[in-house]
């Protein structure tokens, strides 16, 4: 394959293999619906190869189409809790720069305690992704229950 | 990087494109919460390119970051069943080698009969992934309702 | 980018990076359970790089293993609505050519108003994917709530 032959000696980052998987650090103060993320091998199985964290939000370093995925589990939750506090909604979007602000992915917890989804979307260098959790329920910080990641797919 | 150099005229497996999609074979005997998987073109649309099955569990053959995804639908399920049998939980984790044992992905069926999620995670050659379904409910073996797969993403 | 330079001027499509992300255009007439999709930069963040739309259905242009993903949110929906109209089911499948017709992915809305999933599956040039939504509830056309996409993963 000519694609394979063409990859002589380039560092991985230059191959466009930007990828990140984050774990929940904490929720924001009152009136701040954002979730704050953390990543790195010292923290377990989370990592950032290319993208960076800016005050707990994920900043993109390479233009391209990305697969964005997320799972959020509510911490103290049952079917009745979830429906009583309804609607608790999670939205993933570009929050900066302001000129590019847009919601990319939105899900509500109805009678469930976990949401999980993924989508392909174009992102540009400098885009910062925010994950907003509306409502009063707290997300679980267990690393197998709540996580957020991106994977560069193509230019 | 030798990875780049090594790609001259090599078969696809050497490009690091390890990928597998499995269908449910059977559940375990009493006291064994694991799901047992099967894959291969003779079985339909499931396949293994790189990873292997070891007694129905998926074993990784190449180090790297993988996208792991799963969907499980309960066959014996209704909205009331799901909540009455609560909690039925699905967990995907590394079950061997024991030194690397960890839960990677966990979801509960609350009032629903299907869970689906995905995440990025580092896996190493020899890691075996197990999918544990707690509770007594039986998963559907329909290939469009229950499946489990991995995709190598980058070194 | 050096990545681009290293690729000997091959167009991206020849690298096998076929990818598409679609937004909902409209539902079908009575007795037609299919969802009709649209895509393109003029419509927002949807796009088609390789695959094409044929009367609102997605047609594959390159053989290979694909990651197929979907999220559908019901428009006028609450837990009680969802359970009263229960079960509304979404199925993604190959609908043409008829000889390859098969259901790839199926989920029911139980007490929830959103389903989301993904899977790896082999697809061939000319395969057309259809998404059938059974039941009487209407899907949301918000681009962050309902979307459908494919990503070429390997030959």
């Amino acid at each position: 394959q000519r694609f394979a032959q063409a990859q002589q000696q380039l560092p991985l980052e230059s191959l466009g293999w930007d990828v990140a998987e984050l774990q929940l650090n904490h929720t924001g103060p009152q009136q701040d619906p954002r979730l704050y993320w953390q990543g790195g091998p010292a923290l377990g199985r989370s990592f950032l190869h290319g993208p960076e964290l800016d005050k707990g939000q994920l900043r993109i370093h390479r233009d391209g189409i990305y697969m964005v995925h997320i799972q959020v589990t509510l911490a103290i939750c049952s079917s009745t809790t979830a429906s009583r506090h309804h609607p608790t909604t999670l939205a993933v979007g570009i929050c900066s720069p302001a000129s590019r602000s847009i919601s990319l992915l939105r899900l509500s917890f109805h009678q469930g305690c976990t949401i999980a989804s993924q989508r392909l979307t174009p992102l540009a260098r400098g885009d910062t992704l925010c994950t907003n959790l509306t409502g009063t329920l707290l997300p679980s910080r267990n690393t197998d229950e709540t996580f957020f990641g991106v994977q560069w797919v193509r230019p | 990087q030798r990875f780049a150099q090594a790609q001259q005229q090599l078969p696809l497996e050497s490009l690091g494109w390890d990928v597998a999609e499995l269908q449910l074979n059977h559940t375990g005997p009493q006291q064994d919460p694991r799901l047992y998987w099967q894959g291969g073109p003779a079985l339909g649309r499931s396949f293994l390119h790189g990873p292997e099955l070891d007694k129905g569990q998926l074993r990784i053959h190449r180090d790297g970051i993988y996208m792991v995804h799963i969907q499980v639908t309960l066959a014996i399920c209704s909205s009331t069943t799901a909540s009455r049998h609560h909690p039925t939980t699905l967990a995907v984790g590394i079950c061997s080698p024991a030194s690397r044992s960890i839960s990677l992905l966990r979801l509960s069926f609350h009032q629903g009969c299907t869970i689906a999620s995905q995440r990025l995670t580092p896996l190493a050659r020899g890691d075996t992934l197990c999918t544990n379904l707690t509770g007594t409910l039986l998963p559907s073996r329909n290939t469009d309702e229950t499946f489990f797969g991995v995709q190598w993403v980058r070194p | 980018q050096r990545f681009a330079q290293a690729q000997q001027q091959l167009p991206l499509e020849s690298l096998g990076w076929d990818v598409a992300e679609l937004q909902l255009n409209h539902t079908g007439p009575q007795q037609d359970p299919r969802l009709y999709w649209q895509g393109g930069p003029a419509l927002g963040r949807s796009f088609l790089h390789g695959p094409e739309l044929d009367k609102g259905q997605l047609r594959i242009h390159r053989d290979g293993i694909y990651m197929v993903h979907i999220q559908v949110t019901l428009a006028i929906c609450s837990s009680t609505t969802a359970s009263r109209h229960h079960p509304t089911t979404l199925a993604v499948g190959i609908c043409s050519p008829a000889s390859r017709s098969i259901s790839l992915l199926r989920l029911s809305f139980h007490q929830g108003c959103t389903i989301a999933s993904q899977r790896l599956t082999p697809l061939a040039r000319g395969d057309t994917l259809c998404t059938n939504l059974t039941g009487t509830l209407l899907p949301s056309r918000n681009t962050d709530e309902t979307f459908f996409g494919v990503q070429w993963v390997r030959p």
């Epitope: - | 059977h26 006291q31 329909n142 | -």
Partner: antibody, heavy 120, light 108 residues
Framework: EVQLLESGGGLVQPGGSLRLSCAAS????????MSWVRQAPGKCLEWVSV????????NYAESVKGRFTISRDNSKNTLYLQMNSLRDEDTAVYYC?????????????WGQGTLVTVSS | EIVLTQSPGTLSLSPGEGATLSCRAG???????LGWYQQKPGQAPRLLIY???SRATGIPDRFSGSGSGTDFTLTISRLEPEDFAVYYC?????????FGCGTKLEIK
């Protein structure tokens, strides 16, 4: 050819116990879940219980939960139903049924049935 | 649980005629997970149709199933003498699986 042969039915007093057996042949027994379905005289068919091919994950109808136990011995290709605390309303023909490969609540082959009569 | 109502309770027809049997569900049946069985006196039920419209192995093509949601139909295009029996529908989309109480197809 798939064959299922039930045995163990008979007359029993309320509160008593009975164990039904179902001998299977003509298919790979351990690969399939198995079920019991019953039919009271002049009544509809009623699902009773199901067990997975490996013998785990037994499930029961609400009407028999806590009283009936389904089990299997794959080495003998035999399915069992242990029925305790029997009631008048448990009187029925009990069918052993092979479960479809993919759908655990759907039955593609049935035995001829064995009659259980609960009466004082 | 999902209640299945079959109609008519009894259907009297002659060999060579067509028969239409109805099964109505109290709520929508998931993924058209509905089957039809035939039972003759003293015999075990025999699977005819699964998934609302797929014929089981060895079932003659005069038997066909249709429907989705809450309304399902079993059609026998030309009745043969051996077709006179009781027919049951069953939903297997949700637990517990439930059966209709049957339609008796008898010779007129």
């Amino acid at each position: 050819e798939v064959q299922l042969l039930e045995s163990g039915g008979g007359l029993v007093q309320p509160g008593g116990s009975l164990r039904l057996s179902c001998a299977a042949s003509g298919f790979t027994f351990s690969s399939y879940a198995m079920s019991w379905v019953r039919q009271a005289p002049g009544k509809c068919l009623e699902w009773v219980s199901v067990i997975s091919g490996s013998g785990g994950r037994p499930n029961y109808a609400e009407s028999v939960k806590g009283r009936f136990t389904i089990s299997r011995d794959n080495s003998k290709n035999t399915l069992y139903l242990q029925m305790n605390s029997l009631r008048d309303e448990d009187t029925a023909v009990y069918y052993c049924a092979k479960v479809d490969y993919s759908n655990y609540l759907f039955f593609d082959y049935w035995g001829q049935g064995t009659l259980v009569t609960v009466s004082s | 649980e999902i209640v299945l109502t079959q109609s008519p309770g009894t259907l009297s027809l002659s060999p060579g005629e067509g028969a239409t049997l109805s099964c109505r569900a109290g709520q929508s049946v998931r993924s058209s997970y509905l089957g039809w069985y035939q039972q003759k006196p003293g015999q075990a039920p025999r699977l005819l149709i699964y998934g609302a419209s797929s014929r089981a192995t060895g079932i003659p093509d005069r038997f066909s199933g249709s429907g989705s949601g809450t309304d399902f139909t079993l059609t026998i295009s030309r009745l043969e003498p051996e077709d006179f029996a009781v027919y049951y529908c069953q939903q297997y989309g949700y637990s517990p699986p439930t059966f209709g109480c049957g339609t008796k197809l008898e010779i007129k």
